[in-house]
């Protein structure tokens, strides 16, 4: 009889009827920026502090009647989902509410900014344990709201935001589009995207993961023991805020980057039917539903990686797309993808002291995406080995020549548009282990990294017959760091990583009589961290 | 991410006859004006003036005061609703959109964003 949403996100072995800590206390504090709330509700009483913060616009309409229970409805429900005694995720967590939404559920960017500043001030005046900020609201894209979220995140605060209920690209809304925010889309009891009237959950590359957001039972402000079902990406975000609070309660030293990576790693994969999303957004939208990860004591030390997509470059001939990792993360590889196949490849370059992944559009191309593989690895040190495009002569292999450095990724780009050049084999582990091999007209970039106990290997999978994509997965215990397409007789559209799977996309030429040398191959670089071992390249 | 802005970013030039009135602000505006792409969500008349990241607290207050002074000379009353400095340097101001060109020429200004609505999700 546990509500379906709690069953979904908290594995049975981690569930207790009781508060998350024996005395119901928690060192984590959650700040909720929403409507006013009914703090006396049995579900949340004694756990909620209503701050004196209030920054809301006037309600619309002269005949608007402020009914307390309606004014408190949204916020009370969310407070219950985060920390409610029975229907809450993080049952022992204390919550502070800031009123930034009026009785109609409307607020302003400026009011939200002042609310975020209030939290920062509180943090400075009275430093406490870990802070989680829940933003169950969305407006149009706002550079300043995103900046404020970024600055607050840099102080160690974890921000969780609703992706938005507009059945649209979450990148067009704020704070959902802020890279430092954990952005949450909504799924239903069948793990499918939530439909809300004619609209529904937002999607796209700015969504980090999905969580339950349909028919969620929680505290109703109608009375102190009333409950009701509500739906939306706010409810989904509240689940993730609760999970984050539980994670921080167990491991208070977890950073934002670690939290995000662990949420991604332990989420339930490939249960969402992607057909609900617009076709061009399917590849960008994460197919994962949040679950509470085990504690770091049980799973510490492993290499954690995630895929970060850039915005679309646009179609101009010189257009580029840039994907960035979070400051704590290391960029271990860079690839690119174009639906038309017209691209000039990808490379890692330094911008403002940070390594970024850049993809280059080609003449006649409809635009490209850069795809960064962003990883967390203690004491990692990476460098890029470049070989400029050879004017003539054989393919030039690029390997990691520094001692104890291993290959984690390969990038290739062409200074001139030569689609034929892209159809040549680029990387062959069975011939040259641990080397990037580029066509003579391509510049080759090898990403070489050193970290204690880091070992890597190339794993390939080829299909000789007609195919639109070829995949290869790293086995259990190994993490995908690099992904390339080794094209046969087909035009490669590019390659990208989906969790631990390397996906090579091609425009198939339709020839079924290819030899194995002409086969399209997905080549994955799989790494693992064994802190006791030395860095090494594993020969297959 | 910033490159996503499905966003209106406008460079507002000051009318030439105004230039003579702008003593200290006679340099060309390099700051940009931004507003929500969804017209129904815009709140014209309220603006967040965002200053360069390194701007000191005192400079934020001076900039806001300077804008009030310049506006008053032109017969406009503006109201500084809030001054930001804990997360970013800037201030929230209620003023006529006529003054945007002037505000964009203020020293330290990086961009000005028109206020807009957010909604419970």
């Amino acid at each position: 009889s546990i509500p379906w949403n709690l069953e979904r996100i908290i594995p049975a072995w981690q569930q207790t009827e009781e508060d998350s800590s024996p005395d119901g206390s928690s060192q984590v504090e959650v700040y909720l920026l929403d409507t006013s709330i009914q703090s006396g509700h049995r579900e949340i009483e004694g756990r909620v502090t209503i701050t004196d913060f209030n920054s809301v616009p006037e309600e619309d309409g002269t005949r608007f009647h402020r009914q307390a229970s309606k004014c408190d409805s949204h916020g009370t429900h969310l407070a219950g989902v985060v920390s409610g005694r029975d229907a809450g995720v993080a049952k022992g967590t204390s919550l502070h509410s800031l009123r930034v939404l009026n009785c109609q559920g409307k607020g302003t960017v400026s009011g939200t900014l002042i609310g975020l500043e209030f939290i920062r001030k509180s943090q400075l005046i009275q430093p406490s344990g870990p802070l989680v900020v829940l933003l169950p609201l969305a407006g149009g894209y706002s550079r300043i709201l995103n900046t404020a979220c970024q600055r607050l995140a840099r102080t160690g605060v974890v921000l969780v935001a609703a992706a938005g209920n507009f059945r649209d690209d979450a990148c067009l809304y704020s704070p959902a589009s802020a890279p430092e925010v954990i952005t949450v889309g909504a799924t239903n009891a069948q793990d499918q995207p939530v439909t809300l009237g004619t609209l529904g959950t937002n999607f796209g590359r700015c969504v980090d993961l999905f969580a339950p957001g349909k028919d969620i039972i929680g505290a109703s402000s109608d009375c102190s023991t009333c409950y009701m079902s509500q739906s939306g990406t706010s409810q989904a975000a509240a689940h993730v805020a609760g999970i984050v609070a539980m994670m921080l309660n167990r491991d208070p030293a977890l950073t934002l980057a670690e939290l995000r990576q662990r949420l991604i790693l332990f989420s339930t994969k490939d249960v969402i039917n992607m057909a609900w999303f617009p076709e061009d957004q399917r590849v960008l939208t994460p197919n994962r539903v949040a679950t509470l990860p085990p504690s770091t004591q049980e799973t510490g030390g492993q290499l954690l990686c995630r895929t970060v997509w850039s915005a679309h470059s646009g179609p101009t001939r010189t257009a580029t797309a840039t994907a960035r990792c979070a400051p704590e993360e290391e960029l271990l590889s860079c690839s690119s993808f174009s639906r038309s196949g017209r691209r000039r490849g990808d490379r890692i370059e330094a911008i403002g002291g940070q390594q970024v992944c850049k993809a280059l559009n080609a003449f006649g191309g409809e635009g490209v995406y850069a795809v960064a593989r962003c990883c967390l690895l203690p004491r990692v040190n990476c460098s890029i080995h470049n070989t400029p495009a050879a004017r003539a002569g054989p393919q030039t292999p690029v390997h990691c020549h520094q001692k104890d450095h291993v290959l984690t990724g390969c990038s290739f780009h062409w200074e001139v548009e030569n689609l034929r050049a892209q159809q040549q084999p680029l990387l062959r582990s069975r011939h040259q282990p641990g080397q990037c091999v580029g066509h003579q007209e391509a510049s080759v970039h090898a990403s070489c990294c050193h970290a204690p106990g880091l070992e890597c290997k190339i794993k390939e999978h080829g299909i000789a017959g007609p195919a639109e994509q070829v995949t290869v997965a790293c086995e259990a215990g190994w993490t995908l760091t690099g992904c390339n397409v080794l094209p046969g007789a087909s035009l490669p559209l590019g390659a990208y990583s989906v969790d631990n799977v390397c996906v090579a996309r091609i425009r198939d030429a339709g020839r079924a009589d290819r030899t194995s040398e002409e086969a399209t191959v997905a080549a994955a670089i799989c790494c693992r961290s064994r802190p006791s071992a030395k860095a090494s390249w594993v020969h297959q | 991410q910033d490159e996503d802005g499905d966003y209106e970013e406008l460079m507002l030039a000051l009318p030439s006859q105004e230039d003579s009135l702008v003593d200290e602000a006679s340099h060309v505006a390099t700051a940009t004006f931004r507003r929500c792409s969804k017209e129904a969500w815009r709140l014209p008349g309220t603006y967040v003036v965002v200053l360069m990241e390194e701007t000191q607290r005192l400079q934020v207050e001076q900039t806001a005061h300077r804008l009030q002074t310049w506006a008053a000379r032109r017969g406009y009353v503006i109201k500084v609703l809030h001054v930001f400095y804990d997360l970013f340097p800037g201030f929230l101001v209620k003023m006529s959109s006529d003054l945007l060109g002037l505000a964009l020429k203020l020293p330290h200004v990086e961009y000005i964003e028109e206020d807009s609505l957010v909604f419970a999700q």
């Epitope: 009781e18 005694r85 229907a87 039972i217 109703s220 109608d222 009375c223 023991t225 | -």
Partner: antibody, heavy 118, light 107 residues
């Protein structure tokens, strides 16, 4: 597992008082409100009142305000109800029940049968 | 005080039948209604909470519905062990109030 233990029966004289106990185990006593319910023989259920064990806050049915007093002892995880000035009308089974906010009164004691007789 | 009225004190039914018990609140109580079963000589047992949610371990032949003032408790296929008195209770406000109870008799 959750248990609420109540003594089986109490025999009291008219005009006297009685203090009924309800010992909770298997959960954090201070996390959930405790309710008391009266049931006269062959009759329905009548709500007396509730107490929050964490802070001692109480709510009473107006009808029982001068009859019942609810208290708790956190150290022994026990809830008490004192009934005063007993008459034959007070002869009934008295149940304690834990209320979880969402699930209502999910665990009940076995009830204490109070007989008021001279 | 909110009055909860169960219009039938007794209901007679046969094994395998579908039976519905109604409960009417004197004012809007949202969905803050619970249903309890009390078998002879036992303490009450929670079956349904928040008007329509089945409590842990309760067989799925028991269902609840309604909101506002009108609530229904249904047993889709009565079993011999369902012989009991069924009470509705409002949790909307204090004092909490119970319906008078409906005794289910098996023919």
């Amino acid at each position: 597992q959750v248990q609420l233990q109540q003594p089986g029966a109490e025999l009291v004289k008219p005009g006297a008082s009685v203090k009924l106990s309800c010992k909770a185990s298997g959960y954090t006593f201070t996390s959930y409100w405790m309710h008391w319910v009266k049931q006269r023989p062959g009759q329905g259920l009548e709500w007396i009142g509730e107490i929050n064990p964490s802070n001692g806050r109480t709510n009473y049915n107006e009808k029982f305000k001068s009859k019942a007093t609810l208290t708790v002892d956190k150290s022994s995880s026990t809830a008490y109800m004192q009934l005063s000035s007993l008459t034959s009308e007070d002869s009934a089974v008295y149940y304690c029940a834990r209320e979880r906010p969402l699930y209502a009164m999910d665990y009940w004691g076995q009830g204490t049968s109070v007989t008021v007789s001279s | 005080d909110i009055v909860m009225t169960q219009s039938h004190k007794f209901m007679s039914t046969s094994v395998g039948d579908r039976v519905s018990i109604t409960c009417k609140a004197s004012q809007d109580v949202s969905t803050a209604v619970a249903w309890y079963q009390q078998k002879p000589g036992q303490s009450p047992k929670l079956l349904i909470y928040s008007a329509s949610y089945r409590y842990t371990g309760v067989p799925d032949r028991f269902t609840g519905s309604g909101s506002g003032t009108d609530f229904t408790f249904t047993i889709s296929s009565v079993q011999a062990e369902d012989l009991a008195v069924y009470y509705c209770q409002q949790r909307y406000s204090t004092p909490r109030t119970f319906g008078g109870g409906t005794k289910l008799e098996i023919k």
